[in-house]
């Protein structure tokens, strides 16, 4: 026999959930024990079954989860999962804050990504800082040339998607270019989209030929930097 224990504590590290009104919230407390424990939920210390909540709640015991759709300000509070069996019990608190700000298009920090100059063979990082109430979807694009032209007949540029992810992925806001060559030179765009709309900003990467070692030695102060 074994008292309940958390099977994936790393998935429970995010204690405070601050989400815009209208979003779906999911709290999980994956656990195990012998005998198999049961899970119940409390809101602000009281048994919570969601009967007074518009839209109710979804309890998925096999996933140890509580799901609330279309959260509203009255859903704010402390949500406790209580996991127990005959041997013992454990609990964990989640804090829910419901934000009432007007969701807007993603806002990109001015000046990012920044125009960059690099030498062939070096590594480049292009940075894009995004602020968004709604979870944004990020794409890094490179503007390309097709049949000698940068633009299609419709007047829009040809682009190639280099990287795509949601904002909660690690380092999604950085585009790494390793060991750059002359072909990597050109225009790069960071595009952020959410349910309201898209925003995007671009930067130019200039790639210079490898420095001649003899020339560099003669003029060390003339080295290129970003």
């Amino acid at each position: 026999q074994q008292a309940p224990y958390w099977t994936h504590p790393q998935r429970m590290e995010k204690k405070l959930h601050a989400v815009p009104a209208g979003n779906t919230v999911k709290f999980r407390c994956p656990a195990a024990g012998n005998p198999t424990p049961t899970i119940r939920w409390l809101k602000d210390g009281q048994a919570f079954h969601g009967e007074n909540r518009i839209g109710g709640i979804r309890l998925r015991h096999q996933h140890w989860s509580l799901v609330m759709e279309s959260v509203v300000p009255s859903d704010r509070g402390t949500y406790t999962c209580l996991v127990e069996n005959a041997v013992g019990s454990i609990r964990y608190n989640y804090l829910l804050d419901v934000l009432e700000r007007s969701p807007h298009r993603p806002i990109l920090q001015a000046g990012l990504p920044a125009n960059t100059t690099a030498v062939v063979g070096s590594d480049v990082e292009l940075l894009c800082k995004v602020y968004s109430d709604a979870q944004p979807h990020i794409q890094w694009l490179k503007h390309i040339v097709i049949n000698g032209s940068s633009f299609g007949a419709d007047g829009f540029p040809y682009v190639q998607v280099l990287k795509t992810a949601d904002i909660n992925s690690s380092e999604v806001e950085v585009l790494y270019l390793r060991n750059v060559s002359a072909e990597d030179a050109g225009e790069y765009t960071c595009l952020a989209g959410n349910s309201i709309g898209l925003s995007y900003q671009s930067a130019w990467l200039t790639v210079l030929p490898e420095e001649d070692p003899t020339w560099t030695a003669a003029a060390p102060e003339a080295r290129y930097t970003d």
Partner: antibody, heavy 124, light 112 residues
Framework: EVQLLESGGGVVQPGRSLRLSCAAS????????MHWVRQAPGKGLEWVAV????????YYADSVKGRFTISRDNSKNTLSLQMNSLRVEDTAIYYC?????????????????WGQGTMVTVSS | DIVMTQTPLSLSVTPGQPASISCKSS???????????VYWYVQKSGQPPQLLIY???NRFSGVPDRFSGSGSRTDFTLKISRVEAEDVGVYYC?????????FGGGTKVEIK
């Protein structure tokens, strides 16, 4: 051809419920946010709700918050609006509108494609 | 919420003459990405709205070049250089920068 086709409208009594649907075709539905906009008879346009491409984000006008629920089924290319506790003032034509996509916007990033609308009448 | 105020309420125009519709927003619609998110629509009788202009001044595909959009931050204008009979309808401006998305009250354009 890009098309949105609403259905589910009708006459309903105050306090009752109705579910509207919008069938999308001619584009990759799962890559676009989708909106509902309504228009009361002889009046202007009022935005109702939006749902993100994957259904994870939903926003509502204050006038319908807590009563209406927007949802989508990307496997069926369908957008829905569940309308509960209907009021006389909800009487309107309800339009399904394509929102922002996920990729580079070759033109406007949404609000370019509208359905023909479905009429909802709330009356006792 | 951003309020969109449209003037005039109605407009009676002689075919071939210009027409101008004004729209004012209660907050700037100039976004950090440098674009101004005001859209213009026309709604003809019994039909859904049709997009004319997006992002302040870009004509939507298939829209005749007699339609143009201009303005900055909070003051916007839709111009029809030479009105034609088919242009009758109700014209709306819309802000597409934040939720709730909001529309102007509409301007009814008629032919004299």
């Amino acid at each position: 051809e890009v098309q949105l086709l609403e259905s589910g409208g009708g006459v309903v009594q105050p306090g009752r419920s109705l579910r509207l649907s919008c069938a999308a075709s001619g584009f990759t539905f799962s890559s676009y946010a989708m909106h509902w906009v309504r228009q009361a008879p002889g009046k202007g346009l009022e935005w109702v709700a939006v749902i993100s491409y994957d259904g994870s984000n939903k926003y509502y006008a204050d006038s319908v918050k807590g009563r209406f629920t927007i949802s989508r089924d990307n496997s069926k290319n369908t957008l829905s609006l569940q309308m509960n506790s209907l009021r006389v003032e909800d009487t309107a034509i309800y339009y399904c509108v394509r929102g922002a996509g996920q990729g580079y916007p070759y033109g406007p990033d949404g609000f370019d494609i509208w359905g023909q609308g479905t009429m909802v009448t709330v009356s006792s | 919420d951003i309020v969109m105020t449209q003037t005039p309420l109605s407009l009676s125009v002689t075919p071939g003459q210009p027409a101008s519709i004004s729209c004012k927003s209660s907050r700037s619609l100039l976004h950090s990405d440098g674009k101004t998110y005001v859209y213009w629509y026309v709604q003809k009788s019994g039909q859904p709205p049709q997009l004319l202009i997006y992002e302040l001044s870009n004509r939507f595909s298939g829209v005749p070049d007699r339609f143009s959009g201009s303005g900055s931050r909070t003051d916007f204008t839709l111009k029809i250089s030479r009105v034609e009979a088919e242009d009758v309808g109700v014209y709306y401006c819309m802000q597409y920068i934040e939720a709730p998305l909001t529309f102007g009250g509409g301007t009814k354009v008629e032919i004299k």
